[in-house]
């Protein structure tokens, strides 16, 4: 039976150009963690190997950076990052489990005057 | 002027599917996530998903898995929501919004959908 | 997911009166950042929802300042401090801070 749960950083709204950090804990299992995923849609960013360490897509190497931990720092964002990450954490012997983060990016001009927000 | 139009009250039969159209205006379309949510009669709001329009990038709620697909046409910055093997339970005022750092700043008028055959 | 409760589900007001409509969280919705994302809005009969307070406290333009919103964690609250009528409606609280993003049940505000 699988007791654990997964908790993240929580939703980011971050600016372009600006850098975040993805991360998830599981906790209330005594499973072992035997790989960590980052995925983004359908595309993989990241895996984290317990016996292998950390392995980052080619596509991403120039932006993404391993840790803090299991975690996954994201680098001079762009809008096309907005999106949601997935934490897919392998373990035995409950199986998998994951955690979702939804990641919004804004432009400068929006993060500073848009939709009329007014901040008293 | 922000404003996000919607498509007309539909009456559909049991079994079938549809798609609800949302016209943006007023800001740069492809800036901004765009939400759907619905409301049941009587029932509180639900998130059902959102998409991207920079990108097409998608996230839904579990629930509305294989019952709600979300596209964009970013060339006359419109979203689109099909809803799929209809049945009395989809029966709903369905809204477009707005995202803005997870808060719905702007919402459509609302689709009225009706499921009976 | 996570589950937010609001209370009253009902609130029968006169005008003029001050009422507070509390909002409580399955969990904290503070982020890694300290941001948190939970914002208010007003569903009037025949119209749309609208926006009156994103991340706790700050009011959407156009908003009147009778309308303000605090809290922290997993408790927050909505005051609204002299009832007008184009105040009546219901009341919901959103959480958008843990996928998927989830409404409160909603407040009835409505003439006693």
């Known amino acids: 039976m699988m007791t654990g749960t997964i908790e993240t950083t929580g939703n980011i709204s971050a600016e372009k150009g600006g850098s975040i950090i993805l991360q998830c804990h599981l906790s209330s299992t005594t499973a072992q963690v035997t790989q960590v995923n980052w995925e983004q849609q359908d595309q993989l960013l990241a895996i984290c190997n317990a016996d292998l360490g950390w392995h980052i897509s080619p596509s991403f190497k120039d932006r993404v950076a391993p840790g803090p931990g299991l975690g996954l720092t994201l680098q001079s964002l762009t809008v096309n990052d907005t999106g949601e990450y997935f934490c897919i954490y392998h373990t035995y012997p409950d199986g998998t489990y994951t955690g979702r983060i939804f990641l919004e990016v804004l432009e400068s001009s929006v993060a500073e005057h848009g939709a009329r927000f007014q901040i008293p | 002027e922000v404003q996000l139009q919607q498509s007309g009250p539909e009456l559909v039969k049991p079994g079938a599917s549809m798609k609800i159209s949302c016209k943006a205006s007023g800001y740069s379309f492809t800036g901004y996530i765009m939400n759907w949510v619905r409301q049941s009669h009587g029932k509180s709001l639900e998130w059902i998903g959102l998409i991207n329009p920079y990108n097409g990038g998608t996230s839904y709620n579990q629930k509305f898995k294989g019952k709600a697909t979300l596209t964009v046409d970013k060339s006359s910055s419109t979203a689109y929501m099909e809803l799929l093997s209809l049945t009395s339970e989809d029966s709903a005022v369905y809204y477009c919004t707005r995202l803005l750092r997870f808060a719905m700043d702007y919402w459509g008028q609302g689709t009225s959908v009706t499921v009976s055959s | 997911d996570v589950v937010v409760t609001q209370t009253p589900l009902s609130l029968p007001v006169s005008f003029g009166d001050q009422v507070s409509i509390s909002c409580r969280s399955s969990q904290s919705l503070a982020n890694s950042y300290g941001s948190t994302y939970l914002s208010w809005y007003l569903h009037k009969p025949g119209q749309s929802p609208q926006l009156l307070i994103y991340?706790?406290?700050n009011r959407f333009s156009g908003v009147p300042d009778r309308f303000s919103g605090s809290g922290s964690g997993t408790d927050f609250t909505l005051k609204i401090s002299t009832i007008k009528p184009e105040d009546l409606g219901m009341y919901y609280c959103l959480q958008g801070t843990h996928q998927p993003p989830t409404f409160g049940g909603g407040t009835k505000l409505e003439i006693k």
């Open positions: 991340g706790i406290s």
